[in-house]
Interface confidence: low
């Protein structure tokens, strides 16, 4: 899916507003430090796809997040603010049923939220390389502590 | 089981305001999506908008942005649809539809019982 | 604006027979869904996503298509199947076609 024409603010309102909170439920209980952030994204468009992947994309060691709070909000957020993002999830959708068993918190669930705070905090600033922080406040990083 | 509960029946004159409400049961009513969709008579489907339960985000058919206002109370678990400054042909059925964005091809696979507006000087 | 174009609009057969409905988009799009009305009746779900049966649908109704054109075929008309049929798409406001009569010859 190409995530060019998304409402950007929209969606990143959607994060600032339940979004970001859900993901600190999530880490919750976990150190700060404990986790490096290793997945980067350089512009908004980007920084959507790689957080899609790991949101809804099953992994080694974290079979799926996609019934999480987070996730299902993302994936909320995407479908309204994303013209036609609902219909290119309807197949992986699906293969996310059948995968479904039970939500277990794995350290590796852990490690990728962790990457996941990180992708979102990006989108939020996305002009920070080349503008410096004047046109984009740090609005979330009261509320996290993860170093990026 | 899946409900949608409409409110009742309503005649307006021109220029006037209709607010119609939709009573969700059977799921978590933030979980999923709610649609608006309106049927003149003897006419297509017509979708109004469309918000999310959790955050009230919307999105609004342009035709409608303006005159429509799409709400929800969660406490209730129910939606709302506000179309203002109503003419004749606003007259119509008017359907909340839930949408739930987990089932394969996000379309509206419940739908409420319908609210008949009358917009008659 | 997707707009999409159903044909033809009323279709006259005889229970038994085989109906096949069309639904032409005004541009290319991923997925089609397909509703049934009744009279007085809040519309029902029949196909999703091109091809996926609806929970509680008979197995006489299929969908195919892509791109532009998309088609609901129902096998066998049955007595209950005589009803108004809708297209619907999502690209990024959702849009129905204007309906396809079938009514008993």
């Known amino acids: 899916y190409d995530f060019t024409n998304c409402d950007f603010e929209k969606i990143k309102a959607a994060y600032l507003s339940t979004i970001s909170k859900d993901l600190i439920t999530y880490m919750s209980g976990t150190k700060s430090t404990e986790f490096n952030n290793t997945v980067s994204c350089s512009n908004r468009p980007h920084c959507l796809t790689e957080i899609q992947s790991l949101t809804f994309n099953p992994t080694a060691g974290c079979a799926s997040l996609a019934k999480e709070m987070f996730a299902m909000k993302t994936k909320a957020a995407l479908a309204i603010w994303c013209p036609g993002y609902s219909e290119t999830q309807i197949n992986a959708t699906q293969a996310m049923k059948k995968a479904r068993k039970s939500k277990v918190t794995t350290n590796k669930c852990l490690e990728q939220v962790s990457q996941l705070q990180g992708l979102w905090r990006r989108f939020n600033r996305p002009l920070l390389k080349q503008q410096g922080s004047s046109d984009y406040k740090d609005d979330d990083d009261k509320h996290h502590h993860h170093h990026h | 089981e899946v409900q949608l509960v409409q409110s009742g029946a309503e005649v307006k004159k021109p220029g006037a305001s209709v607010k119609v409400s939709c009573k969700a049961s059977?799921?978590?009513?933030?979980?999923?999506?709610m649609n608006w969709v309106r049927q003149a008579p003897g006419q297509r489907l017509e979708w109004m908008g469309i918000i999310s339960p959790y955050n009230g985000g919307t999105s609004y058919n342009q035709k409608f942005k303006g005159r429509v206002t799409l709400t929800v109370d969660k406490s209730a678990s129910t939606a709302y649809m506000e179309l203002s400054s109503l003419r004749s042909e606003d007259t119509a059925v008017y359907y909340c539809?839930?949408?739930?964005?987990?089932?394969?091809?996000?379309?509206?696979?419940?739908w409420g019982q319908g609210t008949t507006v009358t917009v008659s000087s | 604006e997707i707009v999409l174009t159903q044909s033809p609009a009323t279709l006259s057969l005889s229970p038994g027979e085989r109906a096949t409905l069309s639904c032409r988009a005004s541009?290319?799009?991923?997925?089609m869904h397909w509703y049934q009305q009744k009279p007085g009746q809040a519309p029902r779900p029949l196909i999703y996503a091109t091809s996926n049966l609806a929970s509680g649908i008979p197995a006489r109704f299929s969908g195919s298509g892509s791109g532009t054109d998309y088609t609901l075929t129902i096998s066998r008309l049955e007595p209950e199947d005589f009803a108004v049929y809708y297209c619907q798409q999502w690209s990024s406001n959702r849009t129905f076609g204007g309906g396809t009569k079938v009514e008993i010859k």
């Open positions: 539809a839930r949408e739930d964005y987990d089932y394969d091809g996000y379309a509206m696979d419940h």
């Open positions: 059977g799921y978590t009513f933030t979980d999923d999506y």
């Open positions: 541009s290319s799009v991923s997925y």
